[in-house]
Interface confidence: low
Amino acid sequence: AITEAREEAKPYPLFPGPLPGSLQTDHTSLLSLPHTSGYQPALMFSPTQPGRPYTGNVAIPRVTSAGSKLLPPLAFKHTVGHIILSEHKDVKFNCSISVPNIYQDTTISWWKDGKELLGAHHAITQFYPDDEVTAIIASFSITSVQRSDNGSYICKMKINNEEIVSDPIYIEVQGLPHFTKQPESMNVTRNTAFNLTCQAVGPPEPVNIFWVQNSSRVNEQPEKSPSVLTVPGLTEMAVFSCEAHNDKGLTVSKGVQINIKAIPSPPTEVSIHNSTAHSILISWVPGFDGYSPFRNCSVQVKEVDPLSNGSVMIFNTSASPHMYQIKQLQALANYSIGVSCMNEIGWSAVSPWILASTTEGAPSVAPLNVTVFLNESRDNVDIRWMKPLTKRQAGELVGYRISHVWQSAGISKELLEEVGQNNSRAQISVQVHNATCTVRIAAVTKGGVGPFSDPVKIFIPAHGWVDHAPSSTPAPGNA
């Protein structure tokens, strides 16, 4: 690239001959005047490429003696107004002023866009004293300029509480287009329109944009930055980028992948974490989401039993966490479990089915036909019952628990008996005469104790009476 230095301030009055409007520091033979007495250089511009320095010369005005009141107004000399150069070049510019020697302690500060430049900047101030005046040249150099160096630079000098300000020097760093907004990756619905945005800036302006889809240009004619590309819809994944062009060349944005939303892949690795008599805790690993967030999942449960009707229970749950407690299951049953998840496009296929079993549970029904007799001759109570009738067992029956409560005036005592699973009768000793005995029976499995039967009461008289308690629950068919 060619580095340019353009002079756009008022022309120097002391240049012999016409001043060019634009000075190409790279390949133009530039004017150079000797440093004669009374003259000081006003501008030094140092390009990185070969070429002789440009030295503007400004006469320092004559002043009267130090005692005279007739001092000329102090002002910075005019210097170059506008410097245009390419990124990464070096630049040096200055401002100069002639100050009568009566003034002491003069300092020059540099400002950029209204803020003082402090610290580690390459600013050098040189003093050239003469009999009556001192020429002060403040130089400012920047190595390897960047876009952030663009701006308006001025010199300021304080004398006698007055501030003298130079004309601005505008630095314009030109380079390849710089993206301020690049297209973003997106997941889109198939055959649905969407927009991509690309914006790039110079200088130099203008910046023109070309769009590229899968390595092919989309627009024949460039669009001025910023550019919005409306894609009418895709049927398959595509990669888009944009090219930004200016006079310095071309910059290409990052390529962004536009994915087509699809139904998700089925979940994988369905696992059993915990089983109880009536619930199973499962987890799963979600499948690929099809470029669209999961909305919810469906847990499908089939009972694996030749006698079951093969119906599927469906439990809907949120997509996260990837865990669900399936409830309301039968005890001691085998189930086949699958998981499917959905996104905005639709449902995934079901995961591979896994087998799971519930554990033994407590019985769900009480024994039937509980009958209580008083066997007076033996001074005991005879209890009979029928095994609970259920279509399916909650577990292996291990026995029965008999509760008998004895109540007489002011006394109540509960006793518990356990009998084996093959029993359907039991005898208990009379605990108290002239009292009421209340009997309840529950079936017992390894999973726990089932519900107790309805209470059956029998009155135990003083010796000589007989009382008979009817069945608590009529057996089916025994009206």
């Epitope: 049927t235 398959e236 994944m237 699809a262 139904i263």
Partner: antibody
Framework: QVQLQQSGPELVKPGASVRLSCKAS????????INWVKQRPGLGLEWIGW????????KYNEKFKGRATLAVDTSSSTAYMELHSLTSEDSAVYFC?????????????WGQGTTLTVSS | EIVLTQSPTTVAASPGEKITITCSAS???????FHWYQQRPGFSPKLLIY???NLASGVPARFSGSGSGTSYSLTIGTMEAEDVATYYC?????????FGAGTKLELK
């Protein structure tokens, strides 16, 4: 369950055309692409193209462009492939497959295949 | 067109043996786009592994897949008689969708 039921074997003369069918069941027909794959005896599998039943969008393998035409009838959940200007090179088993969407493209279900014999 | 090269072309193995089939792609493919099929004699191909390493529904755990970039492989941990088939790799990254030429697995 998902099923793709293809039409029976065909014996046709060189230069003629033939239309093969593939009836889908057990899923929402318009959600997935239907693909067609060719397999010649002792040779590998060759993808012919797909059709997206929801809007009829088709994508062909350049090798089969102009020789194969894909179509669907959504009311009967049936996909069709017509092959034109047949030669002995077209003698093969043709499978219809369900495509698991185009940016991961794989074929999760396959029809049983239709045997096409081109002979004079 | 992405060309998939499978090797070996044929492999004979005894029951219980470990088998590895490789598939090399002519350009880099993300693992999401790489799949394997099994075709038993006289039957349609069947999806075996999708997205490089995910087992399709009903596929025994002795099958596994791995790979990235241009190199992918299918492994049968312990060969069984029912595994006699031709195995095909497939890429879903770009059209035309392409398959490998197949690896025929025979019983020794």
């Amino acid at each position: 369950q998902v099923q793709l039921q293809q039409s029976g074997p065909e014996l046709v003369k060189p230069g003629a055309s033939v239309r093969l069918s593939c009836k889908a069941s057990g899923y929402t027909f318009t959600t997935y692409d239907i693909n067609w794959v060719k397999q010649r005896p002792g040779l590998g599998l060759e993808w012919i193209g797909w059709i997206y039943p929801r809007d009829g969008y088709t994508k062909y393998n350049e090798k089969f462009k102009g020789r194969a035409t894909l179509a669907v009838d959504t009311s009967s959940s049936t996909a069709y492939m017509e092959l034109h200007s047949l030669t002995s090179e077209d003698s093969a088993v043709y499978f219809c497959t369900r495509g698991y969407y185009d940016n991961l493209y794989y074929f999760d279900y396959w029809g049983q295949g239709t045997t096409l014999t081109v002979s004079s | 067109e992405i060309v998939l090269t499978q090797s070996p072309t044929t492999v004979a193995a005894s029951p219980g043996e470990k088998i590895t089939i490789t598939c090399s792609a002519s350009s880099i493919i993300s693992s999401n786009y790489f799949h394997w099929y099994q075709q038993r004699p006289g039957f349609s191909p069947k999806l075996l592994i999708y997205r490089t390493s995910n087992l399709a529904s009903g596929v025994p755990a002795r099958f596994s897949g791995s790979g990235s970039g241009t190199s992918y492989s299918l492994t049968i941990g312990t060969m069984e008689a029912e595994d006699v088939a031709t195995y095909y790799c497939q890429q879903g990254r770009s059209v035309p969708l392409t398959f490998g030429a197949g690896t025929k697995l025979e019983l020794k």
